[in-house]
Amino acid sequence: AVDLTLLANLRLTDPQRFFLTCVSGEAGAGRGSDAWGPPLLLEKDDRIVRTPPGPPLRLARNGSHQVTLRGFSKPSDLVGVFSCVGGAGARRTRVIYVHNSPGAHLLPDKVTHTVNKGDTAVLSARVHKEKQTDVIWKSNGSYFYTLDWHEAQDGRFLLQLPNVQPPSSGIYSATYLEASPLGSAFFRLIVRGCGAGRWGPGCTKECPGCLHGGVCHDHDGECVCPPGFTGTRCEQACREGRFGQSCQEQCPGISGCRGLTFCLPDPYGCSCGSGWRGSQCQEACAPGHFGADCRLQCQCQNGGTCDRFSGCVCPSGWHGVHCEKSDRIPQILNMASELEFNLETMPRINCAAAGNPFPVRGSIELRKPDGTVLLSTKAIVEPEKTTAEFEVPRLVLADSGFWECRVSTSGGQDSRRFKVNVKVPPVPLAAPRLLTKQSRQLVVSPLVSFSGDGPISTVRLHYRPQDSTMDWSTIVVDPSENVTLMNLRPKTGYSVRVQLSRPGEGGEGAWGPPTLMTTDCPEPLLQPWLEGWHVEGTDRLRVSWSLPLVPGPLVGDGFLLRLWDGTRGQERRENVSSPQARTALLTGLTPGTHYQLDVQLYHCTLLGPASPPAHVLLPPSGPPAPRHLHAQALSDSEIQLTWKHPEALPGPISKYVVEVQVAGGAGDPLWIDVDRPEETSTIIRGLNASTRYLFRMRASIQGLGDWSNTVEESTLGNGLQAEGPVQESRAAEEGLDQ
């Protein structure tokens, strides 16, 4: 079972001093969202017992395995159900504490009732403040039964629940009719999933015989030991004031565990600590009683004395729960209550015994859960004991369970059961994850989900180039850290696999699935420099650059041009995808802007050093487009263009530029300047006959303006081919006169 304890401090004179603490003895408990599991949760559960809203409770984490709830302002804050949740994955466990008001009308004789499937459970509510009215019983907040107030027996209202089944488990309450729910008696009923002494899916397995009030868990057959006891069968008492599965926790305060209620995972429930009893766990056990809630009786023999925390303390020469066994009877010594081995290992198990007559090798045997008896292969005989060594055949999962070492001599016999846990070495369910890559190294997150059992003691990362038959390289890493694989080849695929190990011999699991991780290209090292640039318009810039000459092939896939507009805080990036390119036209720039310009060589995703930057000023934007452009063929080699000046000019036009292009032609267009800005007409000469041309034009002030609409016109007739278009301008009026 999960090592989880919910402690309730029951000093109820002052609710503000009341606190609940949840303590986990699990490895790595409560660390949060790392690979080792979720944190401890401690909260009030208002689903069944609703109390008036108050200020929120304060949750304080004390280290990684303890959480405390405080901030109770009035007694009604305490009434109800509290729960602590701890453990990870399938081991996630909820521990529940039910708090009753000491001033309630009805009080439970016993809060927690753990019963077996098929038993009859009897809940008893003691009358504390009498009301001559009906008593309403509820189960998990819903109506369950009514008792007439005349049905009280010896001042108690009893609810009999015959033949209980696991679904009957839950919170029960007894309340006087139409009285405040805070005056109720609250109970917790835990119904084990099996009959007495049985556990397992079909209840076919036999419980180990839990001692000292321990309760056999119906799922795993383990004993959930009362606070203050430990061991596979709860056979060992902790020192006073200690609790936890290994007695590792200490009760807070100078009065030890006085005034504390301990709640443990089901099917145990809650009780006082060992040596204490009473509704507030403040009364010491009466003479002759010991253990949690003082439920156990000592009945010591042969001069043994009763200790209220541990039971019988035997005089020299005697041992046993009641000091009933003479030391002359053989006795198993110092047998661990629990051993852990990995699947398919062949461990050696030692079992030591003493007694009179002295045990010899043949008198000590080891019995497996399936009844197989192993005889020792060798024995070490010392003056005070004999230690038999057993070589265990290859372990299988079915070997998990309770083993028994037994010694028999003519003086009698003794046996000691111990639990063997056969653990499955962990096997990764997924491949490791690539975090970052460079040309010669890969950074990998190795810890993945796995099948089998933890904890993970070591992580091995195996890697080699893809499709290689060479030996795998291996690196052993800390489970919680990322791994850097170094000294790799650039631009190479590597097959990477994880192998996990758990503690102990044979704890190495099978390798996990492979994944392909590819190193990056080598970084480009050449630094380009900018040869020059010229403005081809208010928003166009042509840039050229060079690279230093070096022997060997060029390491690079292309160039990245960067334009930084410092005024607006904007960067423009232009990708030139040919490593042979040495020039680029940048368009769509912002007119009238200062740019800082540089160029870098890139290879894969890596950038080389940037060129020294250049500073470029684009001219401001030009004037609007000329209006109503019109073309009229005059001859087989001449076409006249007419237009109207642009509107809303920001200044005087310095010239017009006409663009001439053969319709459907593949060649570059021809630009012709009209240097007399007052003109609104021009004749383009030297054209080819019977040829369709496209024309558009724009004005220039400080910079070139927007293009006009494009017009089409064909030259006339079938004349000779001209040498190429030229232009003649005149004022529109003059053209009309002609």
């Epitope: 009301k131 009215t133 009906d134 309403i136 109506y143 039964y145 009514t146 049905e151 139409e178």
Partner: antibody, heavy 118, light 108 residues
Framework: EVQLLESGGGLVQPGGSLRLSCAAS????????MFWVRQAPGKGLEWVSG????????RYADSVKGRFTISRDNSKNTLYLQMNSLRAEDTAVYYC???????????WGQGTLVTVSS | QSELTQPPSVSVAPGQTAVITCGGS??????VHWYQQKSGQAPVLVVF???DRPSGIPERFSGSNSGNTATLTITRVEVGDEADYYC???????????FGGGTRLTAL
């Protein structure tokens, strides 16, 4: 679905007897306190009698004490009201009702009419 | 024994708010329950424990209780709300259930 179905009503002469039944379904009958409530024609509701789950404890209104007997058979999920020495003022619709977890009636039957007349 | 007093009738226009009272000595110290009984039908619990509504009862029905008067309030009254309404308490002195005389609600 909780259902309560009364039967056994009818015309009876003063001084006569009648036994009403209430068949319950849709809930665990043996856990609930059950009641009879009546309503005279054109009048309000009047509580008549109640019985606890075990059947061992009963309650009666003063107007019927000594004449009416409430009982139940948990194995048959049925509530009964044995009415003796009937009077004209016992003429009413008799309702069977279930008590909830408070002092209220959360489910009622449709009622059965008892007429006491010569 | 408790005596519960209700007005014989209350009339409101549809869409308005109806308030039905139930008077009794220190009724605020008891839990009051309200039932609706439409003509020719069995009573139906509409409010219990002063102010709680069973599932299926519209939010238009609400209750309150203090001093010597408990109140059933029906907002946005509909024609379908026309019925007799009874208050009820449990008399802890006699262990009897006590009903008020009933109030007929009419939607004008």
């Amino acid at each position: 679905e909780v259902q309560l179905l009364e039967s056994g009503g009818g015309l009876v002469q003063p001084g006569g007897s009648l036994r009403l039944s209430c068949a319950a379904s849709g809930f665990t009958f043996s856990r609930y306190v059950m009641f009879w409530v009546r309503q005279a024609p054109g009048k309000g509701l009047e509580w008549v009698s109640g019985i606890y789950p075990s059947g061992g404890h009963t309650r009666y209104a003063d107007s019927v004490k000594g004449r009416f007997t409430i009982s139940r058979d948990n194995s048959k999920n049925t509530l009964y009201l044995q009415m003796n020495s009937l009077r004209a003022e016992d003429t009413a619709v008799y309702y069977c009702a279930r008590r909830g977890s408070g002092g209220y009636f959360d489910y009622w039957g449709q009622g059965t009419l008892v007429t006491v007349s010569s | 024994q408790s005596e519960l007093t209700q007005p014989p009738s209350v009339s409101v226009a549809p869409g308005q708010t109806a308030v039905i009272t139930c008077g009794g000595s220190n009724i605020g110290g008891k839990s009051v329950h309200w039932y609706q009984q439409k003509s020719g039908q069995a009573p139906v619990l509409v409010v219990f424990d002063d102010r709680d509504r069973p599932s299926g009862i519209p939010e238009r029905f609400s209750g309150s209780n203090s001093g010597n008067t408990a109140t059933l309030t029906i907002t946005r009254v509909e024609v379908g709300d026309e019925a007799d309404y009874y208050c009820q308490v449990w008399d802890s002195g006699t262990d009897h259930r006590v009903f008020g005389g009933g109030t007929r609600l009419t939607a004008l």
